[in-house]
């Protein structure tokens, strides 16, 4: 067909952005292109074309009219991770093609098992006490907090320091005695460790 004067090659006007999404949740990678004739949009992940509902109506990925890629739910197993990776959208018409910036889709995870549960501690009043835990593996890296007797620990108390997985009480009081739980949290949710007992003995 003849080149029409008003026709022009595709250009990407909205590039996809990096995403971190929880497994099972919906997600959208945006892509918008201009061109005349209106360009077709295809998505590629790691160099392989991404199958969508246009290829298989049962697909959990949908190519939206705008050109965006919509995931009905992010699929992510212990081994198979078909949705995680680096994506680009490619807009094409007879005058050429335009490729978007790379966008990484990462899947947030939070495993169940603590790498280290805190242990029971017994100290005398006035002595320091240290409890340590290593939260489950997670992405993003889980933050750590502590609960005492089921309630969040008051880390505004200047005697209490939480650094990494360590809970340090510089000078214990009788009232510090109780059941402590380490809590690992990220966007997926939170996990609680096994209970550790702090016993504070009278001198």
């Amino acid at each position: 067909s003849r080149l029409r004067q008003e026709d022009f090659p595709p250009r990407i006007v909205e590039h996809p952005s990096d995403l971190i999404v929880s497994k099972g949740e919906p997600a959208t990678l945006n892509c918008k292109a201009e061109g005349r004739p209106t360009p077709t949009i295809e998505w590629y992940k790691g160099g392989e074309r991404v199958e969508t509902d246009k290829d298989d109506p049962r697909s959990h990925r949908m190519l939206l009219p705008s050109g965006s890629l919509f995931f009905l739910r992010i699929v992510h197993g212990r081994r198979s991770k078909p949705d995680e990776g680096v994506y680009v959208c490619v807009a094409r018409n007879y005058l050429g093609e335009a490729v978007s910036h790379n966008a990484s889709l990462e899947v947030a995870i939070l495993r169940d098992d603590f790498r280290q549960n805190p242990s029971d501690v017994m100290v005398a009043v006035g002595e320091p006490a240290v409890m340590e835990c290593q939260p489950p593996r997670g992405h993003p890296e889980p933050t750590i907090s502590w609960k005492k007797d089921g309630s969040p620990l008051d880390d505004k108390d200047e005697r209490i320091t939480i650094r990494g997985g360590k809970l340090m009480i510089t000078y214990t009081r009788k009232s510090d005695a109780g059941k402590y739980v380490c809590v690992g949290t990220n966007m997926v949710g939170e996990r609680e460790s096994e209970v550790a007992e702090l016993t504070v003995l009278e001198r």
Epitope: K45, D56, V75, G77, R78, R79, S80, P82, D83, D112
Partner: antibody
């Protein structure tokens, strides 16, 4: 349509090797682990191992280590299973199966009958 | 290795019966348990994944339950097309149960 199509039936002599292929289509080949499972006549299912089509990494149960090789060619979206030093008790239907993101075998090949006989 | 023990190995039932098949793991596998149906000369077909989730396109008369070491597949009202062999599979490290053949009484 998502499917796995396997190579045809084979008849082999004891001591020989067999290579079974599994052509994947309709999905992103490198996104899903591929497993191999076999079934001797009248018997149950036996897992033989997996390959990560993205990296080529493999994992096998102790029973098959040293005798089974799993490879893939991403350019033609095909996985291969090579079993060496064949014995009569290797006579079975060999299946490839895709492991879904839900940790289950959601798509299976049609099976390849391998007969080992002198 | 995690050993999966399925019971019974075979059972006879009539159309309309409620059928229960059990699967026991030799150690805890959380909910990493799947169920498959296999008919003679055919590849297995996924019915239930993650112990209790129904695979797309599978009739709702099939259900799964359990976690840890003990799991159950239930067919609420057996249909003629359900006569087949059923396998459990743990996907924690991957192995299959021995199978349960469901035959016509």
């Amino acid at each position: 349509e998502v499917q796995l199509v396997q190579s045809g039936a084979e008849v082999k002599k004891p001591g020989a090797s067999v290579k079974v292929s599994c052509k994947a289509s309709g999905y992103t080949f490198t996104g899903y682990y591929m497993h191999w499972v076999r079934q001797a006549p009248g018997q149950g299912l036996e897992w033989m191992g997996w390959i990560n089509p993205n990296s080529g990494a493999t994992n096998f149960p102790q029973k098959f280590q040293g005798r089974v090789t799993m490879t893939r060619d991403t350019s033609i979206t095909t996985a291969y299973m090579d079993l060496s030093r064949l014995r009569s008790d290797d006579t079975a239907v060999y299946y490839c199966a895709r492991e879904s993101g839900d940790d289950a075998f959601d798509i299976w090949g049609q099976g390849t009958m391998v007969t080992v006989s002198s | 290795d995690i050993v999966m023990t399925q019971s019974p190995s075979s059972l006879s039932a009539s159309v309309g019966d409620r059928v229960t098949i059990t699967c026991r793991a030799s150690q805890s596998i959380s909910s990493y348990l799947n169920w498959y149906q296999q008919k003679p000369g055919k590849a297995p077909k996924l019915l239930i994944y993650a112990a209790s989730s129904l695979q797309s396109g599978v009739p709702s008369r099939f259900s799964g339950s359990g976690s840890g070491t003990d799991f159950t597949l239930t067919i609420s009202s057996l249909q003629p097309e359900d006569f087949a062999t059923y396998y459990c599979q743990q996907s924690y490290s991957t192995s299959f149960g021995g199978g349960t053949k469901v035959e016509i009484k």
